[in-house]
Amino acid sequence: RTTTCFGDGCQNTASRCKNGGTWDGLKCQCPNLYYGELCEEVVSSIDIGPPETISAQMELTVTVTSVKFTEELKNHSSQEFQEFKQTFTEQMNIVYSGIPEYVGVNITKLRLGSVVVEHDVLLRTKYTPEYKTVLDNATEVVKEKITKVTTQQIMINDICSDMMCFNTTGTQVQNITVTQYDPEEDCRKMAKEYGDYFVVEYRDQKPYCISPCEPGFSVSKNCNLGKCQMSLSGPQCLCVTTETHWYSGETCNQGTQKSLVYGHHHHHH
């Protein structure tokens, strides 16, 4: 947030930008974590908006027996490779058709041994707090389906009657990589030295990185008529003074009527 400054006091303000704020000629430009005229206030919520989708990549190897390996298959721009890629992609699209998270396959390498196909199976799901479970389940179904097809679609009498045939023993899952998204970790990192006081709370399955100074959450600190302010020692209530009352206490819940105090003092005089 920024506050524009007009008049003679502006130069003084320029040299007083705090917490890494920079003067742009009119106002203090504050870093993400701060706001206020001098960047003196700590924000109460940090945007850690999750990605819309989370991806996973499975590195698989299958052995295709219905195609004989030729040197041209090593060249990804050759007609041979392009045709193989088309057939293999169509075959895998059929194999994985029941998996909503399935996006496609990407061949990384073809090598000798009938045709050994090193490839990635790409998965994607909408972000929810349960995305890990969703993708873990999808990877298990991928394993089941590829194992099944490579067991069933095999050469008989040296001829394949399917779109592609496989060597049952040539199917291997080398590695599974899931895009890591850890809102708690992101929240802690972005809150920097205030990280101990910021927490992640979910609303409509969306994570919010908030301090107790952000109203409307279960961890929110109720300062009553006071103002919640974050400091390095945690959130604190800054209590206000009205025309009639002083407020005090940890949550500014103790009100003292000024007239009673003044009356008491006059009594002593």
Partner: nanobody
Framework: DVQLQASGGGLVQPGGSLRLSCAAS????????MSWFRQAPGKEREGVAI???????GYADSVKGRFTISQDNAKNSLYLQMNSLRAEDTAVYYC?????????????????WGQGTMVTVSS
């Protein structure tokens, strides 16, 4: 684009012979594979025979010993010699080609197709 054109079909009596030809527009498939498929009325297209650039040939069980596939790379041509023809051989015959050295007689494995030629076996 690669062009394939099948010819040589016709009416033949049971037990008779016929030779089908398939002309390719160039020799693109001389290092890959070529094949014959057929489709009888109301039925799915099925593989008949396949020949690869390494000299390998394969046949559907229903035609083994009766049909012979061959090719002439100099003429960019594929042939199917059909002997001892039966009524159940009646179908439209298609030639197909691939850049790959294939061992598959499933139409989904083949990307390049020619126009069909009709073979009718009837007395």
């Amino acid at each position: 684009d690669v062009q394939l054109q099948a010819s040589g079909g016709g009416l033949v009596q049971p037990g008779g012979s016929l030779r089908l030809s398939c002309a390719a527009s160039d020799n693109t498939f001389s290092r890959g594979s070529m094949s014959w498929f057929r489709q009888a009325p109301g039925k799915e297209r099925e593989g008949v025979a396949i020949i690869s650039s390494d000299g390998w040939t394969g046949y559907a069980d229903s035609v083994k010993g009766r049909f012979t596939i061959s090719q002439d790379n100099a003429k960019n041509s594929l042939y199917l010699q059909m002997n001892s023809l039966r009524a159940e051989d009646t179908a439209v015959y298609y030639c197909a080609a691939s850049f790959l050295v294939l061992r598959a007689l499933n139409p989904k494995a083949w990307h390049y197709w020619g126009q069909g030629t009709m073979v009718t076996v009837s007395s």
